[in-house]
């Protein structure tokens, strides 16, 4: 629809006034300073500095690998018996004296031989190592047990199996020098002993080896 001619004129005049003032706008007073901006990103790395002075000479170190390879020689011993056939139920069975070269080493010990336990009722027997008469305490005793329960009532007889077995372990905290390593047979706590036999009809051996820690 058409706009009346009077209204058109008024609109043109308004626009001219606005345009005129836009072109002549004076600058006002400075505003309050704005807040600081966020920190900028890191700059590029600087050039390396000049090398520092040499440090003081360090103390002579110990090469572990070198000292181990040069000074650790294998140290082991085997004592063997062709037929111990030892029927004791309590006491020392066999002994082997070993020369331990260092204090800060462990002893690995092994007894291998036939073991037998028999009884009509429940019984238990313990085979264990001693070192100069004392059991290992570094960390715990080296032992093996055989427990035999009573057989069925109708079988009024005892089973008699001799089986080659081993008692083995590591013991720490034993000083350098002569060490008497012995295998003993004894009782288990709270159980009656039976009829034990060690080393029947076969070779028995104690093997002792010194190991670095």
């Amino acid at each position: 629809s058409e706009i009346p001619k009077g209204k058109q004129k008024a609109q043109l005049r308004q626009r001219e006034v606005v345009d005129l003032y836009n072109g002549m706008c004076l600058q006002g007073p400075a505003g309050v300073p704005g807040r600081d901006g966020s920190p900028g990103a890191n700059g590029i790395p600087g050039t390396p500095g000049i090398p520092g002075r040499d440090g003081f000479k360090g103390e002579k170190g110990e090469c572990l690998r070198e000292s181990f390879e040069e000074s650790w020689t294998p140290n082991y011993k085997q004592c063997s018996w062709s037929s111990l056939n030892y029927g004791i139920d309590l006491g020392k069975i066999a002994e082997c004296t070993f020369t331990k070269m260092r204090s800060n080493s462990a002893l690995r010990v092994l007894f291998s031989g036939s073991l037998r336990l028999k009884c009509r009722n429940a019984c238990c027997q313990r085979w264990y190592f001693t070192f100069n008469g004392a059991e290992c305490s570094g960390p715990l005793p080296i032992e093996a047990i055989i427990y035999l329960d009573q057989g069925s009532p109708e079988m009024n007889s005892t089973i008699n199996i001799h089986r080659t077995s081993s008692v083995e372990g590591l013991c720490e905290g034993i000083g350098a020098g002569l060490v008497d390593v012995a295998i003993w047979v004894g009782t288990c706590s709270d159980y009656p002993k039976g009829d034990a036999s060690t080393g029947w009809n076969s070779v028995s051996r104690i093997i002792i080896e010194e190991l670095p820690k």
Epitope: T99, M101, N132, G133, A176, L178, D180
Partner: antibody, heavy 119, light 108 residues
Framework: EVQLVESGGGLVQPGGSLRLSCAAS????????MNWVRQAPGKGLEWVSV????????YYADSVKGRFTISRDNSKNTLYLQMNSLRAEDTAVYYC????????????WGQGTLVTVSS | EIVMTQSPATLSVSPGERATLSCRAS??????LAWYQQKPGQAPRLLIY???TRATGIPARFSGSGSGTEFTLTINSLQSADFAVFFC??????????FGQGTKLEIK
Amino acid sequence: EVQLVESGGGLVQPGGSLRLSCAASGFTFSNCAMNWVRQAPGKGLEWVSVISGSGGGTYYADSVKGRFTISRDNSKNTLYLQMNSLRAEDTAVYYCAKANWNYAYFDFWGQGTLVTVSS
Amino acid sequence: EIVMTQSPATLSVSPGERATLSCRASQRVSSNLAWYQQKPGQAPRLLIYGASTRATGIPARFSGSGSGTEFTLTINSLQSADFAVFFCQQYDIWPMYTFGQGTKLEIK
């Protein structure tokens, strides 16, 4: 109380023999290595020989090897040192010394017995 | 074989004072070192083992320290009964039956 009592020392001619004894009490003798240590007049301590508790192992100082023999009788709690082909330089006070059961330091010593080798 | 060297050979100290004796091993022996005291005409007596542990009946004025190759025996408030010869011995490595040559502690 641990006690070690040596005996058997005396005057002997060069080339002669002597047997020293050491009677032990107050500890489990068979569990301990035993030693002989000697001291020449005005000198320091010189280890002579050691024997394990069981008697299964023995060692000697080079200066006495082949001439001296260490032994023990665990049933009698007694240590022995048989000394043969004695020399003037063997003149010393001989001590019997008990090694600690686990580490080889000497925790008890006898009072010593004097051996003099002279012509 | 490890060689044990003691110093000084002779040490003169007044009663009531402190004495410090040294023992050096030719190689490391951990803490496996013993000290012995020997008075004239008597057998040696164990004073210290494990470098720093006093043997039974040894007074607290005796103390040991050190580890590796350097060891020290210190006697505080010296009494007349303390003057004697002192020996060290390592028992870390076989053969361990070598003693130091001894230090004579005498009254100043």
